[in-house]
């Protein structure tokens, strides 16, 4: 029995729970998901029982090995998986636990602009990047392009200070999770600040 194995999968994709055993006479292998039986295998008896019929088409054993492949992943497949190898040659079953995290492929992140001010020819605002559907474990970074050196900023909020007359800048939000990444539409500093250009002391949402 080894340490817990952490696995990551994407919605619609597949994941393989790796399992090896040198036991000669395996009587049965039992896979469970959050304490619910998933699959029972009897290598010598010749049978594989998939507890829930809807999972039958999703279960596979690559190259006829002990590892279990689960395909057509759904969000609610996330959880704890446990396997026990039972054999009369073992005093107690050989076990392994896995934690599966299933993530969605990220859609295009949405950018909103905070309160904007324009003082002394400098446009100051915040850009906030977020996912519309509240996806989990998303990491945001911002790329600022256009100055001599391109800059990166970590976090969903990007504070902007852009002076009229400077070369235009482009801001792009990058959203990442363990299985995918996506980019916001590029935002140009000049366009962003145009609304506040007429009134040097204006604020707008």
């Amino acid at each position: 029995s080894g340490p817990v194995k952490e696995l990551v999968g994407s919605v619609g994709g597949a994941v393989t729970f790796p399992l090896k055993s040198k036991v000669k006479q395996v009587d049965s292998i039992v896979w469970t998901f959050n304490t619910t039986p998933l699959v029972t295998i009897q290598p010598e008896g010749g049978t594989i029982i998939v507890t829930q019929n809807r999972n039958r088409e999703r279960v596979d054993f690559p190259d006829g090995g002990y590892s279990l492949k689960l395909s057509k992943l759904k969000k609610n497949d996330s959880g704890i998986y446990y396997v026990g190898i039972y054999s009369s040659s073992l005093q107690q079953p050989s076990t392994q636990e896995y934690v599966l995290h299933v993530y969605e492929h990220l859609s295009k992140p949405k950018v909103t602009m905070g309160l904007q001010s324009n003082k002394n020819g400098t446009c100051v605002t915040n850009l906030t990047c977020c996912m519309e559907h509240g996806e989990e474990d998303v990491i945001y970074t911002w790329k600022a392009l256009g100055q001599a050196a391109n800059e990166s900023h970590n976090g969903s909020i990007l504070p902007i200070s852009w002076r009229w007359g400077e070369s235009d800048m482009t801001f792009i939000c990058v959203a990442r999770n363990p299985v995918s990444r996506n980019f916001s539409s590029p935002i140009l500093a000049r366009k962003l600040c145009e609304g506040a250009a007429d009134d040097p002391d204006s604020s707008m949402v």
Partner: antibody, heavy 120, light 108 residues
Amino acid sequence: QVQLQQSGPELVKPGASVKISCKASGYAFSNSWMNWVKQRPGQGLEWIGRIYPGDGDTKSNGKFKGKATLTADKSSRAAYMQLSSLTSVDSAVYFCARSTMIMTGAMDYWGQGTSVTVSS
Amino acid sequence: DIVMTQSHKFMSTSVGDRVIITCKASQDVSTAVAWYQQKPGQSPKLLIYSASFRYTGVPDRFTGSGSGTDFTFTVSSVQAEDLAVYYCQQHYSTPPYTFGGGTKLEIK
């Protein structure tokens, strides 16, 4: 990748014995059952028996008791089958085939076959 | 020993057709049935094990089903390269494992 390479064809006289080999590569030879299967010309398949190279344990089809002896050598990663007291009904192609781990009775990799002809 | 019977020794079909090969066990073998394909001059190739589990790399036009004593092997849309002999085999519990007599699939 998994490969099973069998020895070449044999022409033997009635009453003689023959030993055919199956050299394995690309997988954990000691931990997988190796099967032997007979196929007479134009006929179906007949399971002879299997051996576990890790400890030499064998399971055989009673029909081949006294006819086929299965052995294995871990160091050379080879399985062997000796056929004794040969008669014309032993003329056949003999295959070695590896058992899958998940289903020990299902055979996923097969050798190319060894043709044994018994003729005086 | 358990006897596996494939009632059709030959089956003739056309490319694109659906073909069903049947196999009957002389006693209950649960779902412990494998299907093999053997092309002329070649070794058998495992397609299905435990009645319905497709082996890695086997095209999904090949499917297996059944339990107890009655089993079927289906090719949903026959291709020219499927010309072969198909064998069922029971791998239930204690050996000996036994094979059906084979069904030769011929392309019209």
